[in-house]
Interface confidence: low
């Protein structure tokens, strides 16, 4: 027999199917030009020493074969002895290791069997009424197709589905959409209405995310506030990656989950912009303010659930820098200016009360005064910090107040409002004999001691009523007792206590008169 012809003789090997699970499969035969035809197949198993024979039986019952050797593709013309206008049955027999392995048969009319392509190029994926819709342009000159899809998840095998007949320049398919797992889809096509026509190859994988993006499971840590008044937000644990089916691992366009970080600065509510959304990869610097942070996951179908955290305010206070002067017209604060043209936000809130009671004031952009200080003043009538209680004050600064991530903390401190000197006056001063020349003085703590860092010291003053001599004794703010010694018996003394702040001298308490009795010896 000539190699270009189908040989109508017995093939050169015994006729016995081994029944092996390996062997030829997926036989496809097509017309590739006006007078040429091609059959191709796949072979599963070791290929060494395998010879393939394309078998063909005509409707008359006569059968022939082409010897393909080790190739799994064979071309022949319409002059090869195979009837191309009538139905023929084709299969592949592979002779290997002294046994024959047969492919499943295909029965078709070769002349009308056109090689169909799978969907090529861009397959658009969208969601439609809880289902997945895939759409693609019909390959050139191939309008009229049956389309199938197969899909799998990371934990399930391939499942086959039907897209139905297609008869347009664009083709589409409705497929199941999984709620919580990614899917891999592949599509294939074959000629519509042509009995026995071969399926195309499967398309490249189409990777589809779950309808619901995975809830982000991340953990943050916040570094300490630096000298510049900013602290870095760092990601301690990356979001768990979506598990992907086998064909989507590596590069899987379509299944990407985007994680965005939404910052909400809770402090300083009087500023222009309170929220900002960033990519999770770009971790921001924050001021020492309180923030709510949300991580929002989204995929091509939209946003999913978010995970939220509260980042408390940095309450580390410096014994700095805030000078407060109280005058008849009002109160002025002074602090070291940050830079030229800075906007400051001054926030205050009564200590021990809900953060919702914070009040703030935004300054106009200001330059440092000649002493390098920035200032904020308010009148008594404004009522700001007017009550005799402890306030927590934070001052934030920004050259770009509209940008949430560019605020920094200038300082945090405590301030006792209202008439601090009067309210801070120590009460319940008492004097007790201690020895022949000393007494013990103690008092109830000043109201100022409720405000951390505000009470600088107590001062105890003792006055000799005879000589009018006065002595003053500083006492640590944590102490409420002192021993006065070197006193003389029979002399009248008065004692008073004062509570001082860094910027304000307190009001003396009511004078306490006492004397040490003269001891009469027997």
């Amino acid at each position: 027999c000539r190699t270009s012809e189908c040989c109508f003789q017995d093939p050169p090997y015994p006729d016995a199917d081994s029944g092996s699970a390996s062997g030829p499969r997926d036989l496809r035969c097509y017309r590739i030009s006006s007078d040429r035809y091609e059959c191709s197949w796949q072979y599963e198993g070791p290929t060494a020493g395998v010879s393939h024979f394309l078998r063909c039986c005509l409707s008359s019952g006569r059968c022939c074969y082409f010897a393909a050797g080790s190739a799994t593709r064979l071309q022949f013309s319409d002059q090869a002895g195979v009837s191309v206008l009538y139905t023929v049955t084709l299969w592949v027999e592979s002779w290997a290791r002294n046994q024959t392995e047969k492919s499943p048969e295909v029965t078709l009319q070769l002349y009308n069997s056109v090689k169909y392509e799978p969907p090529l190029g861009d397959i658009k994926v969208s969601k439609l009424a809880g289902q997945l819709r895939m759409e693609w342009e019909t390959p050139d000159n191939q309008v009229g197709a049956e389309v199938q899809f197969r899909h799998r998840t990371p934990s399930s095998p391939w499942k086959l589905g039907d897209c139905g007949p297609q008869d347009d320049d664009t083709e589409s398919c409705l497929c199941p959409l999984e709620m919580n797992v990614a899917q891999e889809f592949q599509l294939r096509r074959r000629q519509l209405g042509s009995q026995g026509s071969s399926w195309s190859k499967w398309s490249s994988p189409v990777c589809v995310p779950p309808e619901n993006p995975p809830q982000p499971q991340v953990r943050f840590s916040v570094e300490q506030l630096g000298q510049d008044g900013r602290r870095r937000l760092t990601l301690k644990e990356q979001p768990t990656q979506l598990e992907l089916p086998e064909g989507c691992q590596g590069l899987a366009p379509g299944t990407e989950v985007t994680y965005r970080l939404q910052l909400h600065m809770l402090s300083c509510p009087c500023k222009a912009k309170a929220t900002r959304t960033l990519h999770l990869g770009k971790m921001p610097y924050l001021s020492g303010a309180a923030y709510n942070v949300a991580v929002i996951s989204s995929n091509q179908f939209g946003p999913g659930l978010n995970q939220t955290w509260h980042i408390p305010a940095d309450t580390h206070t410096e014994p700095v820098a805030l000078n407060i002067s109280v005058g008849t017209n009002g109160t002025t604060m002074y602090w070291p200016a940050r830079a030229q043209s800075m906007t400051y936000c001054i926030e205050w809130q009564p200590v021990g009360q809900d953060g919702g009671l914070a009040t703030c004031s935004l300054t106009a952009p200001q330059d440092p005064d000649p002493a390098g200080m920035a200032t904020y003043s308010w009148s008594r009538e404004s009522g700001a910090m007017g009550q005799e209680k402890c306030y927590y004050i934070t001052i934030f600064a920004s050259a770009h107040p509209e940008k949430l991530t560019l605020w920094s903390t200038v300082l945090s401190t405590y301030h006792f409002g209202g008439n601090a000197s009067a309210a801070g006056t120590p009460h319940h001063v008492s004097v007790k004999n201690h020895s022949l020349d000393s007494v013990s003085v103690d008092w109830a703590p000043s109201l100022l001691s409720t405000c951390p860092g505000v009470l600088k010291e107590y001062v105890v003053r003792c006055r000799d009523e005879d000589s009018k001599q006065v002595s003053e004794h500083p006492v640590q703010p944590t102490e409420t007792q002192v021993t006065l010694s070197g006193l003389r018996a029979g002399v009248a003394y008065t004692v008073q206590v004062r509570a001082d702040t860094a910027w304000l001298r307190g009001v003396w308490s009511q004078p306490q008169r006492f004397s040490i009795e003269v001891q009469v010896s027997d």
Partner: antibody
């Protein structure tokens, strides 16, 4: 030739452990999901466990969950079943089976290895 | 108790036709492909039908499969004494994330 060969069966006392192996040849082992299926004497087939391609996902029948562990070593073309806390009802022929690439059919089966749990 | 239900036994004379049913639910047969396995006495199971109705190479066309809704059927025509075996249906169960089998049907050729 595509082949699966199980080993490691034998007689074991209740509460003890046993490890079965399944050596694969003639195909790309790392591309296929693999099953363990068992058959008690005179009874039907009972699926035991499956492990996917790279070993990143595993599922078990409720009857063995927490006691049996399926694993694979793709570099050695070998599937394993670690069986702990064995019970009399685990007595069976244990088959390993290959999952077809294109569907959920088990297209290749081993010859089986007998496990007898008896005191 | 198997997830899939098969008749325990069927019998017919040589040359006759026999069918074996397999019923399940939407989470298994309803949404997944059914496979059929033949187990000749003393041997390992062998794949007979996959994807509801396809035959692997080497399986004669006397064996056929079909599926409708949540049930599947194996058909064997031209019965031969060599067909005496246990036949099992199997499929994936999407809810259980497990492979499920029927209890098996013993075919006797009279």
């Amino acid at each position: 030739q595509v082949q699966l060969v199980e080993s490691g069966g034998g007689v074991v006392q209740p509460g003890r452990s046993l490890r079965l192996s399944c050596a694969a040849s003639g195909f790309t082992f790392s591309s296929h999901g693999m099953h363990w299926v068992r058959q008690a004497p005179g009874k039907g087939l009972e699926w035991v466990a499956i492990i996917w391609y790279a070993g990143n996902k595993k599922y078990y029948a409720d009857s063995v969950k927490g006691r049996f562990t399926i694993s694979r070593d793709n570099s050695k073309n070998t599937l394993y079943l670690q069986m702990n806390s064995l019970r009399a009802e685990d007595t069976a022929v244990y088959y390993c089976a290959r999952e077809s690439l294109l569907n959920s059919a088990s297209d290749i089966w081993g010859q089986g290895t007998m496990v007898t749990v008896s005191s | 108790q198997s997830v899939l239900t098969q008749p325990p036994s069927v019998s017919a004379a040589p040359g006759q036709t026999v069918t074996i049913s397999c019923s399940g639910s939407s989470s298994n047969i309803g949404n997944n492909y059914v496979s059929w396995y033949q187990q000749l006495p003393g041997t390992a199971p062998k794949l007979l039908i996959y994807d509801n109705n396809k035959r692997p190479s080497g399986i004669p066309d006397r064996f056929s499969g079909s599926k409708s809704g949540t049930s599947a059927t194996l058909g064997i025509t031209g019965l031969q004494t060599g067909d005496e075996a246990d036949y099992y249906c199997g499929t994936w169960d999407s809810s259980l994330s497990a492979v499920v089998f029927g209890g098996g049907t013993k075919l006797t050729v009279l």
